[in-house]
């Protein structure tokens, strides 16, 4: 409506004797600034003076001027937005209606605000969520209609006259909307806290008690449950009685059914506080518990361990590890149910004790063969001794044991011969699997663990064999010692160390890489002739005659072996020279005459020289001399010399004779 | 009948070696350990080592490291104990045992040697 | 090391008596305890093992009892043979040790 001045406040404000009010006011004016305020007192409209009767806590002029008594009261707005207003100390009597009276240039208002004053402080009022459940959080509301800057007040919480240690958020509020002062505190209910007692306490600054409020918490929680058992301890003997009672301390909403758990299984037609168990087995050993309910849920009890005590159960065995191999470790562990646990154990080995092992692990820090076998346990407590279980069975494994390489054909072996040989071992777990063999050849395996070698050969010194499982354990190396004849015979010239000239000392001698057996004998042959039976053929002065192809040849029991030709050369200077004439030693003059200096030399003759009757030398040094045309002048006696790297040789005079022809006769 | 019949006593100057043994009969030789014990003049006794027979696995007091050496000669069923650079705090009966069937070093020992007594002295 | 300790070096009996010999093992041994018994010029013999276990041949006047630290070896009925040195050993941990012996010897 715009023909109204527009106020925003609280509606009622509540305060008591001694304590202050504020007042947050806004306005908006219908036109201009404030020029009058008056502040009445249960204010009475007279219609015949068209004025407002009543108290005036306070006035303020256009000149500003406020009596002295009006302190207690304060105008705290300003001429056209704010209208707030405080009074301190606020009195019993101030309580009513205040009205503001407003006038501006041209219009007037009055506005009323209710003030509560009461003569005590008021309580808080504590506000609850509608259910509380069991450690489930929720937030106790403390709220007061009450905030005052000039006064200062808190909120406290107590439970059951305690202060409570969970810390309270604490907010006021002064605005146009509402004022108050309020507590929170965030709170999970234990079950403990039903029907007890809250309370939310005003104090003042100094924390002096002004007022409260309380309430009873009512903590829906599902039932709390105590169990009482006979024997206390829960230990008995099989064939005992046991008595379980379960008591309900405290259920909200009242509990509406009963039942009972073994190991969090229920147990079926069980469904009375006490739970009777008679004549016990072992297998009622367990956790027991009583469950009640009500509309929260089931509520349990703590558990209780029955131990039903009994001899130690038949025994087994585990083993860590087997199959073990030789020298590593092993554990073994004698299992066996027994309550209480047994006391002593006493192990077997293949039926027979172990002594001094009375625990429940045995161990073995380095398995041997012997140690396979089964291993049996028995064990022992206050209640008496089990029974021996059917054990455990260890298996050793290890590598073949005492590897040999057994030669099978008769000695000696013969160069050529199949021999046969077997790999042996004394024993191995896991079994024998294959063999390996070194050296390594293009031989044949018979059989597992047979090696055939064909046509053996003369340096097959020695054979190791090996047996393997998951390993390969190696034989020592046999030797095969393999009979052989002499091998690589040659000749070989120990003396001279240079070439053989005639005449020279020789030494031939006979060698071989190697015989088995070692005993041998020498023979040496020229052309088919024996010569000598020695390792050495010795010449004291060779002649060329010497020369030649020779061989020699070494026998042992096995065979003979010849080495291959070889040639013996002796040089010598030229010898046996003459000189031949061609066609003959007379000759026709005019004809050809061919003179050959013929010798015998080694190395052959690489120079000559001719002579003449005269022993004057002529220029000539081939093996040929040829005249052509041949004159009577060259009649007369030749001779001719040859010379190689060992020496000269001259031969005899030879005469040639040239004789005129028929012309020249005829000319004559 | 187990015995473990010991080498005769010895008197060895210091700074030698002494080499005593231990032949073993009754039992199989191979499946149990040897072991050797020290006891100064009917003192308490110390354990120096032991051998197995079966593969010449050794092991040694740390204590007697370097001084003392166990071997086993397998064809005569004897174990030797070599002891080098002799003092007199070597002087003591020096006893062989039969050690445990499985091996374990944790044990007590039922059959001992005659003993050997060295005394060393200049 | 493990020590064993014998605190009595020497105890006077006579025959008949019942006698008490101790042994404290410097930390817990379980029952790794034997007992041994030494006469003058001879070897050690196997009297008790697993601190209670009488050996085969063993006379029923000995008997061996304790766990963990303190273990002892029980004669009941004194006889004159068994006038000798006792020696406990543990064999719990490695190296295995032998306390310093005690001796029995007649008042």
């Known amino acids: 409506d715009s023909s109204k001045w527009v106020f925003e406040h609280p509606e009622t404000l509540y305060a008591w004797e001694g304590a202050c009010v504020w007042i947050p006011c806004t306005y908006r004016a219908l036109d201009g600034d404030l020029e009058s305020f008056i502040l009445f007192h249960n204010p009475e409209y007279n219609k015949n003076t068209s004025k407002f009767d009543g108290t005036r806590l306070y006035e303020s002029t256009k000149d500003g001027k406020v009596p002295s008594e009006q302190k207690r009261v304060q105008f705290l707005g300003d001429k056209n937005k704010n209208c707030t207003l405080s009074i301190h100390p606020v009195h019993l009597n101030d309580s009513g209606q205040l009205g503001l009276r407003m006038e501006s240039k041209t219009e007037k208002w009055m506005e009323r605000i209710h003030l509560n004053v009461s003569e005590r402080p008021f309580p808080p009022h504590i506000q609850l969520p509608p259910e509380i459940q069991e450690s489930q959080e929720v937030t106790l509301t403390c709220l007061l209609n009450f905030s005052c800057y000039g006064y200062p007040i808190q909120l406290q919480w107590l439970l059951e006259g305690v202060p409570m240690r969970q810390a309270a958020v604490t907010s006021t509020s002064l605005t146009i909307k509402s004022v108050f002062t309020r507590s929170e505190l965030k709170f999970s209910p234990q079950w403990s806290h039903h029907g007890k007692i809250v309370t939310c306490q005003l104090q003042d600054a100094d924390g002096k008690f002004l007022s409260n409020d309380t309430v009873q918490l009512n903590v829906k929680h599902t039932p709390k449950l105590e169990i009482k058992v006979t024997p206390s301890d829960a230990i008995v003997r099989e064939g005992d009685s046991v008595t379980m009672t379960c008591e309900v301390s405290s259920s909200n909403p009242e509990y509406t059914t009963v039942s009972w758990l073994k190991d969090g299984t229920s147990l079926k037609k069980q469904n009375t506080f006490t739970l009777n168990l008679r004549e016990v087995t072992k297998d009622q050993s367990g956790k027991y518990c009583c469950q009640v309910s009500n509309d929260v849920g089931p509520g349990r009890s703590e558990e209780v361990f029955l131990q039903v005590q009994y001899a130690p159960e038949p025994s087994t065995v585990q083993i860590l590890h087997s199959p073990a191999v030789e020298g590593s470790q092993v554990e073994f562990l004698c299992m066996s149910l027994a309550n209480p646990l047994p006391t002593n154990y006493t192990w077997y080995h293949n039926g027979k004790e172990m002594q001094g092992r009375t625990e429940e692990k045995v161990h073995i820090p380095k398995i041997l063969p012997w140690h396979a076998g089964t291993y049996s346990c028995v064990a022992e407590n206050i209640l008496g001794t089990g029974q021996r279980g059917p054990g455990a069975e260890l298996d050793v494994q290890y590598p073949p044991k005492k590897v040999t390489t057994v030669i099978q054909n008769p000695m000696p072996i013969r160069e050529g011969d199949t021999v046969t040989l077997s790999c042996n071992y004394n024993s191995s777990n896991p079994s024998v699997t294959r063999y390996e063999w070194k050296p390594h050849g293009a031989w044949e395996e018979p059989s597992l663990g047979v090696l055939k070698i064909q046509n053996v050969g003369w340096d097959n010194t020695t054979i190791a064999c090996a047996a393997c499982n998951s390993w390969c354990s190696w034989a020592s190396p046999v030797a095969l010692n393999v009979q052989y004849a002499p091998r690589d015979v040659r000749v070989r010239k120990i003396k001279p160390l240079s070439e053989i000239h005639s005449g020279n000392s020789v030494s031939l001698q006979c060698d071989f890489s190697s015989s088995h057996p070692k005993e041998v004998q020498f023979f040496w042959e020229k052309n088919g002739r024996l010569l000598g039976k020695e390792s050495q053929l010795n010449f004291d002065s060779i002649s060329p005659e010497d020369a030649g192809s020779y061989s020699c040849w070494v026998n042992n029991s096995i065979g003979q072996t010849a080495s291959k030709a070889w040639t013996l050369e002796v040089l010598y200077a030229p010898r046996r020279l003459r000189v031949s004439m061609s066609p003959g030693d007379q000759v026709m003059e005019g004809k050809s005459a061919t003179l050959t200096c013929e010798s015998d030399a080694n190395p052959p003759v690489s120079h000559y020289t001719w002579f003449d009757w005269n022993n004057q030398s002529l220029p000539y040094h081939s093996q040929k001399l040829r005249l052509e045309p041949v004159k009577v002048q060259h009649s007369g006696a030749y001779w001719c010399q040859g010379t190689n790297s060992v020496g000269k040789g001259r031969s005899p005079l030879s005469t040639l004779t040239v004789y005129y022809s028929p012309e020249t006769i005829g000319r004559r | 009948q187990v015995q473990l019949q010991q080498s005769g006593a010895e008197q060895v100057k210091p700074g030698a070696s002494v080499k005593m043994s231990c032949k073993a009969s009754?039992?199989?030789?191979?499946?149990?350990?040897i072991e050797w014990m020290k006891q100064n003049h009917g003192e308490s006794l110390d354990w120096i080592g032991n051998?197995?027979?079966?593969?010449?696995?050794?092991e040694y007091n740390e204590k007697f490291k370097g001084k003392a050496t166990l071997t086993v000669e397998k064809s005569s069923n004897t174990v030797f104990l070599e002891l080098s650079r002799l003092t007199s705090d070597d002087s003591a009966v020096y006893y062989c045992v039969r050690g445990d069937y499985y091996n374990s070093r944790y044990w007590y020992f039922d059959v001992w040697g005659t003993g050997t007594t060295v005394t060393v002295s200049s | 090391d493990i020590v064993m300790t014998q605190s009595q070096k020497f105890m006077s009996t006579t025959v008949g008596d019942r006698v008490s010999i101790t042994c404290k093992a410097g930390?817990?041994?379980?029952?790794?305890v034997a007992w041994y018994q030494q006469k003058p010029g001879q070897s050690p013999k196997l009297l008790i093992y697993?601190?209670?276990t009488r050996y085969i041949g063993v006379p029923e006047r000995f008997t061996g009892s304790g766990s963990g630290t303190d273990f002892t070896l029980t004669i009941t009925n004194m006889q004159s043979e068994d006038l000798a040195d006792y020696f406990c050993q543990q064999y719990s941990s490695f190296p295995l040790t032998f306390g310093t012996g005690t001796k029995l010897e007649l008042k």
């Open positions: 009754g039992y199989t030789f191979t499946t149990y350990p």
């Open positions: 051998i197995h027979p079966y593969n010449d696995d050794t």
């Open positions: 930390q817990n041994v379980r029952t790794a």
């Open positions: 697993s601190a209670s």
